[in-house]
Each structure stands twice: as C-alpha cells, then as structure tokens.
Amino acid sequence: ASNFDCCLRYTDRILHPKFIVGFTQQLANETCDINAVVFHTKKGLSVCANPKQTWVKLIVRRLSKKINKM
C-alpha cells in the first residue's frame, strides 16, 4: 500500500526469498510516515514490509550478502 511512492502500511504476508529480486529502504521523514523495506518481486510488484520483522531482516541480510559478493 503506497501513496506517491510512500508505503502507508505493511503487508500481512510472508514472501519467500526466491520471489524477491531486490529491495529499497523507506525512511520516515516529512514525505513518508513510516520506516519500511520495499521488496521488488519477480512479478514486478513492490511490497511494503515491516523492517522490524524477522523474516524481513533475514531477506534483507541475504540480499545484502549477494550484493556485497558482486
């Protein structure tokens, strides 16, 4: 759920790492209300996720490792 490219709330689903090609981080500021990880999926969807949740942290860590290896 996003408005002007801001996440307004978090997904209530868990995504598998195989579904995700990358992510961006949204920081709460004057433009956006909440901190979020925006996952980009193989289907071209952007999914807003809670950066505090374990499954989100795990995928971010996994993707960050991949990027660092390149």
């Epitope: 995504l15 579904f19 374990t54």
Partner: antibody, heavy 120, light 107 residues
C-alpha cells in the same frame, strides 16, 4: 532431538472455545517459526497460520481469521492455538509444525497432532 | 491465493517400480515448493524442500524436480514402506497452500 509435544485429544461442545498447546524441545524456540495445520478426516492439509516466537508476529490464512488465535510463551517454549465458536466443521486433527527458513521455509518437524471433536 | 493441483489422487504400483507424482501451481512459484509424506496414523514428514533437495533422513530413492508452475516427485524402486499419502506445498507467499494429496498403495 527436536520434539513438538501436543495433547492427543480434546472433546468440546459446539459454540465453545478450545486452546491447544505445543511444547517445543531440543532447539532454540525463538529461532524458528511455528505453523499450525488442519486435517479433517479423509481430507487434505490446510495451513492455518504462523507465529514468529521471537516477536509474536502472526499471519493467518484469511479463512481462519477470527477463528484461530496463535500465541506463544517463550519462557516455557510453548505455542498455543485457540479456536473459537466451534462447529462440527472444526472437528479435525491440528498439527503444530516448526517452520525452518534456513531449509527453504519448510515445515521440518511436526507434532503428533491434537484431535479435536466438536460434539454436544 | 495460489492453488496447488496434484495428480493422480491415488496410485497403485508394484514393489520395484518407479512412480511419479505431479503438482501444478496456478502461477509461477519459482521453486518455492516442498513435498511431505504422511504414513497412516502418523504425522506428515518433510520429504523434499526447495523443489529438489532431499530432507535429512529420507531415502535417496525419492527425488524432486520441476520449475515454474510444474513440479514432480519421483519414487524409484518402490518399497512397501513407501505406502503413504504425498502432499506438495507452495511456500512462495502466504497463505501457504497444499495440493490435495496422492495416496500411494502397493499392488
């Protein structure tokens, strides 16, 4: 070794609630998810929902929202599922199962299941 | 929700034969698929994870393959001990969904 202990059976009246337990041992409880799965007699498996014991984050199959409530007690390494407003459709075996995100999000250990019978 | 369709629903084969069970997803699940074996009166057991990886303690006579929307489980040199119901499961995105199951019997 990893064990998930569930009570064998629960007999409950229509309209009542039941809270079943799943005691985990042999691993660090907060490092793995706990899923709950339903199996009605002669039917397939249905995923109810999952709880992350590290932060109590839950997500449910839409079909079971309002029916099932998942909780954990990390001090006793026990997961719970409460089912409310029971009907004959809720008569089934309910399994707790460990979710392992290190093994492709698979359910790698299962409890023996709790058989719930809803009958007056 | 992603729908999982398993076939056949039941299967009878002789000891020593090779059998294949198929599982189709309603959309691409990118290999996020697991297989479980449930023997009569027992809890399900993880058999294959990530479409192709054999779970610890399971016989190497079991193998998984597939990608995209189509997956299969092959059981080589069938043993009487393989009598069970087999389920595939999508774990790409919640709600995780199971196939209807394939009941394997020995002739």
């Amino acid at each position: 070794q990893v064990q998930l202990q569930q009570p064998g059976a629960e007999l409950v009246k229509p309209g009542a609630s039941v809270k079943m337990s799943c005691k985990a041992s042999g691993y660090t409880f907060t490092n793995y998810w706990m899923h709950w799965v339903k199996q009605r007699p002669g039917q397939g498996l249905e995923w109810i929902g999952v709880i992350d014991p590290s932060d109590s984050y839950t997500t449910y199959n839409q079909k079971f929202k309002g029916k099932a409530t998942l909780t954990v007690d990390t001090s006793s390494s026990t997961a719970y599922m409460q089912l409310s407003s029971l009907t004959s459709e809720d008569s089934a075996v309910y399994y707790c199962t460990r979710g392992n995100y290190g093994v492709d999000y698979a359910m790698d250990y299962w409890g023996q299941g709790t058989s719930v019978t809803v009958s007056s | 929700d992603i729908q999982m369709t398993q076939s056949p629903a039941s299967l009878s084969a002789s000891v020593g034969e090779t059998v294949t069970i198929t599982c189709g997803a309603s959309e691409n699940i990118y290999g996020a698929l697991n297989w479980y074996q449930r023997k009569q009166g027992k809890s399900p057991q993880l058999l294959i994870y990530g479409a192709t990886n054999l779970a610890d303690g399971m016989s190497s006579r079991f193998s998984g393959s597939g990608s995209g929307r189509q997956y299969s489980l092959k059981i080589s040199s069938l043993h009487p001990d393989d009598v069970a119901t087999y389920y595939c499961q999508n774990v790409l995105i919640t709600p995780y969904t199971f196939g209807g199951g394939t009941k394997l019997e020995i002739k």
